[in-house]
Amino acid sequence: LPAQVAFTPYAPEPGSTCRLREYYDQTAQMCCSKCSPGQHAKVFCTKTSDTVCDSCEDSTYTQLWNWVPECLSCGSRCSSDQVETQACTREQNRICTCRPGWYCALSKQEGCRLCAPLRKCRPGFGVARPGTETSDVVCKPCAPGTFSNTTSSTDICRPHQICNVVAIPGNASMDAVCTSTSPTRSMAPGAVHLPQPVSTRSQHTQPTPEPSTAPSTSFLLPMGPSPPAEGSTGD
C-alpha cells in the first residue's frame, strides 16, 4: 500500500526531517508549511493549525521560502552615483550598481556599497588598463614616441605623427608639429580608446611607463588634478 501523505501540521517520525518547503516548529513540535517568497509568517503553526502567511508590505521583501515574522526591508534608494538595476519588489531587494564613468570600489552581497569615479589619466599619461564595473582605470606614462594631450579615463598614448621636417618635436604630452603642410604619416585625429583589458597583474619597475590607480582627495585645493571624489555609499 502507498504511504499515507501527511498534511501540515504533522509530527515527523523520530529521526526524520520535514519535507521541502516545510520547517520544524520547536514550540508546536510539528512540521509546518513555510511561506512562499513575497510572504512572511503572520501566525505561526500550532499542533492543530498550519502557518498563516501574509504578503510583504511595500518596501519589504522575502526572497526565499521562509517562516520569518516580518519581511526584510529593501535597501535605501540608490545614490546619485548609482543606477537601480533591480527594483524593490515583494520578492527581491533593490540592487544598485555604479553609473557609467564610475566603478564599484567596495561591493556588498548584491550590488555596490561604494562607487567611485573612474580615474582620468592626465596629459602625458594614457590608459594602460581600462576601468570595469569593479576596477578602476590604470594609467601609465606615455613611452618615448607616444603622447596623450587629454585628461581622460579612456584615451591611450598615441604615436607621434611622423614629419618630413619637424617644427617642434613631440613629447609625452604633445604631438610632434610638422613644418610641411602634411605629415608623412599621421594617426587618426580622434582620441584612441583602449580596446581590451590588459593582463591582470603588473609589477613594473623599469624606467618605462607604468600604470596605477587612486581616487580623490579633499586634502588638495580645487585647483588640483582632483582624484575622484570620495564616492558614495549605496546601502
Epitope: V137, A214, G224, P225
Partner: antibody, heavy 121, light 107 residues
Framework: EVQLQESGGGLVQPGGSLNLSCAAS????????LSWVRQTPGKRLEWVAY????????YYSDTVKGRFTITRDNAKNTLYLQMSSLKSEDTAMYYC??????????????WGQGTTVTVSS | DILMTQSPASLSLFVGETVTITCRAS??????LAWYQQKQGKSPQLLVY???KLAEGVPSRFSGSESGTQYSLKINSLQSEDFGTYYC?????????FGGGTKLEIK
Amino acid sequence: EVQLQESGGGLVQPGGSLNLSCAASGFAFSTYDLSWVRQTPGKRLEWVAYINNGGISTYYSDTVKGRFTITRDNAKNTLYLQMSSLKSEDTAMYYCVRGPFYGSANYFDYWGQGTTVTVSS
Amino acid sequence: DILMTQSPASLSLFVGETVTITCRASENIYSNLAWYQQKQGKSPQLLVYDATKLAEGVPSRFSGSESGTQYSLKINSLQSEDFGTYYCQHFWVTPWTFGGGTKLEIK
C-alpha cells in the same frame, strides 16, 4: 581625519623576514592607491612599493623587487608589506603613505608615523 | 632611473630671509614633481604638487616653479616653523626617486 598607523617593525637578523601592517582610517580606503616609503638612518628617502586601489597593479623599487611583497585588504582597511631575505641596507624607518593616485594626482598626501626596521646580526 | 639632484644640501639663514631650493631631474618629468617638508622626529608633509600647486593649508610664502628639468621651491620671509629638511620627488616613471634633501637651519 586621515590616519595611517604602521606596526610590525623590529630587530631581525640578515636573511630573516618581517611583516609590516598599516591600519588606515578617515577616508574611503578602497578608492586610494597606497605606497611604502622608507627613510634610511642617513635620512635619505626611498620609495619602496606601490599598490593601486583594487590591488591589481603593484610596482617595486629595484632594491626590493623579488624580496618584498605589497598587498592590501580593502575589507579590513589595511595595507601590508611582507619583507624577506632582509639585508642590512633595508634598515630604515618604514612609512605607509597615501598615494600617488598615479597618472591623475601624483603625490603622497598623507604619511603615517613610521615603524622602525633594524636588520643586524 | 631618474636622478633628482637637490641643492644646496644645507644652509643656515635668519628668520625673515628668502630662500630658494632647487631640484634638477636627469630627464623630463613633465611637472610630475612634489615637495615635502620634514621636521625633526616627524613624518614628511606635502607642500607642493604638480611642481607649482600648493597643498591645502600651506602658507602662500611657499611657491614652486619650473624651468625645463629644473624645479625650485621658494620660501619668502622665513618663519621659525619653516626650518627643517625639504625633499623633492618625481612621479614620472618608476622608481619614484627623491632628492637628497636640503637641511634648512636657523641662524
